[in-house]
Structures are given as C-alpha cells and as structure tokens.
C-alpha cells in the first residue's frame, strides 16, 4: 500500500464513488449522494474534480485534502457544514471552482479562502450568511 498520509494514494478510487480519467491523465471523482459524513479516504493525488455534494459532511478538518495540487473543482454543496476552518483548502493550488451552496454556514469562510489564487467561481448561496464583510475576498485574485 501507499505511505499512510491522510488517506491519499497515488492511484485509486474511493469506495462506492465513481471515478473516470479525463483527457489530461487526471481523475474525475464523483462521491455525491452517498450519505458520507466525512471526506473519503483513498483519493488519488491526480484528482482534478471531486464531487462531494448531497452528503452529510458536517465539518472539515484543517488540511483535509493534502497534496491535491491538481484539484480544479471541489463540490461540497448540500452538506451540513456550519464552519470551515483556516487551512481547509491548503495546498489546492489549482482550485478554480468551489461549490459551498446549500450548507449551514453562518459566515463567509474568509480565512479558508485566503491564497486560493486560481479560484474563479465560488458559490455560497443558500447558507445562513447574513453579513459579507467588505474585505472578505481580498485574498482572491
């Protein structure tokens, strides 16, 4: 097996998820609507797309997706997230699309979004956010 590092593998498809390689030799991983309460283990470092929407994920630990430097789209819509800690998206250098709608967030996860230099699309609708500070997206380009 692989080095035991936070459930990341060189190759592999998480149990019950659907995985399909794309035209760039990277992996699209669909783990949506599986009743998951936490992020799946055995994610390939070569994952470019990860759909975790419509699950029951209530919290993210800091740095839950280490070394996923090819990840371009992360879908976490329709979960039970109330808070996203600083460092939750550390190392996601290529992340362009982040879907966080339909959760239970009360604040814009400003610190977690810092340094997502590639981010182009962010969805936070259908949460419990009542106030958006004027500088909360200042770390984005």
């Amino acid at each position: 097996g692989s080095s035991p590092r936070s459930g990341v593998l060189l190759r592999g498809c998480p149990t019950h998820c659907h995985c399909e390689p794309d035209g760039r030799m990277l992996l699209r991983v669909d783990c949506s609507d599986l009743g998951l309460s936490e992020l799946p283990s055995n994610l390939s470092v070569f994952t470019s797309y990860l759909d975790l929407s419509m699950n029951n994920i209530s919290q993210l630990l800091p740095n839950p997706l280490p070394s996923l430097r090819f990840l371009e789209e992360l879908r976490l819509a329709g979960n039970a997230l109330t808070y996203i800690p600083k460092g939750a998206f550390t190392g996601l250098y290529s992340l362009k699309v982040l879907m966080l709608q339909n959760n239970q967030l009360r604040h814009v996860p400003t610190e977690a979004l810092q340094n997502l230099r590639s981010l182009q699309s962010l969805r936070l609708d259908a949460n419990h956010i009542s106030y958006v500070p004027p500088s909360c997206f200042s770390g984005l380009h």
Epitope: S2, S3, R5, F46, S67
Partner: antibody, heavy 116, light 107 residues
Framework: EVQLVESGGGLVQPGGSLRLSCAAS????????ISWVRQAPGKGLEWVAE????????DYADSVKGRFTISADTSKNTAYLQMNSLRAEDTAVYYC?????????WGQGTLVTVSS | DIQMTQSPSSLSASVGDRVTITCRAS??????VAWYQQKPGKAPKLLIY???FLYSGVPSRFSGSGSGTDFTLTISSLQPEDFATYYC?????????FGQGTKVEIK
Amino acid sequence: EVQLVESGGGLVQPGGSLRLSCAASGFTFTSYSISWVRQAPGKGLEWVAEIYPPGGYTDYADSVKGRFTISADTSKNTAYLQMNSLRAEDTAVYYCAKARLFFDYWGQGTLVTVSS
Amino acid sequence: DIQMTQSPSSLSASVGDRVTITCRASQDVSTAVAWYQQKPGKAPKLLIYSASFLYSGVPSRFSGSGSGTDFTLTISSLQPEDFATYYCQQSYTTPPTFGQGTKVEIK
C-alpha cells in the same frame, strides 16, 4: 524535450544490492510521479515502485516490498531505486517512467542481472 | 490485484490490414486503461490513454475503445512500423497492472 536516463544497472550476486538512478529533464519534475517498471528477459512489463515527489508518497509491488526503496531528490530532478536482498527473479531491464494516471514517457532502461 | 488479460497473444497480419486487440480486466476499471507499443530492445511508448484518448504524436490509425472490463485497441490500416508488441494497462487501482502482451507479426 522530455528525457529520462537510467543508470546504475549491472551484474550483482544474489543477496547483493544496487542503486538505480533516473535523471529527468524537459518537464516539471514535481508535477508527475516517477515509476520503475521492469521487464524480465522475454517477458512482459511489471510495475515495481512509484514516488510522487511533492508529498513523498510512495508505493511498491508486493514482490519487492521491504527489499526495494524508491526516493527522489527534487533539487537534482532525479529518482532512485535502492534494491537490496536481490534475487535471481529480479533480473530484468528496469525502466523509469513519468506518469500521472498513465506512464506517458519512458527511459531507455538499464539491465540488472542477478547471478552467482 | 486486477488482472488484465489480452487476446490474442500473437497475430500475423499484412500491411494494410485492420487489426484488433482486446483486453479484459478482472474487475471494473472504468476507463482507466492505456495501451503501449514496444519494439525489441526499446522502451514502451504510450499510444492510447483513458481508454480512448490518442496520445500526442501518435498516428490516427490507432484508436481505443471500451469501458468497465472490456477494451479494444484497433489499428485501422497496419503499417510496416506497427509490427511490435502491444500491452494494455490499468491505472484504476494500485498496483497498476499490465496485460501479458500481444505480438503483431508480419504474415
């Protein structure tokens, strides 16, 4: 131009050790994994070991686990395969290959012969 | 480990022939399959990846298809430089595994 150049092969006695090197150039070393794949004389291809340098992730075939160690030096863009407790069945041409999900470029190979 | 079984193990064909090689995985591997060409004394070369994507620089006479457990490599019109051994390989899980090879010889 992508280049992978293996070195370090040769004749070694059973139980002996060898260290293979794979010098990479022409691509971003930290954007790929490096694998070693071997081919015994007249036989097919067998994956041996792999490393993803940014995270230090490694993986091994069961046939070499505990005997072979893969490593990489990102400052030199070079991967290594330390082979200990060599057996006659380890005799093969050893190729290094760069990969994401698939092995898209291979070196020319280096021959390892284990014989007394 | 996932077993990859190729057929035939060898075939004889003429220049201009259409050649088909099949590969069967012992379990579902989605489309995580590649095909390689190897000539004697040389390193393998990637032809097809993700079951059906033609690798850069590979002639369009090569094509791949399949999903799940059954995969095919087709050479639409065999050329003299195509006489070689062809391997399929799965990357769905670790360890990545290869088929035993199909040798394409001149008839």
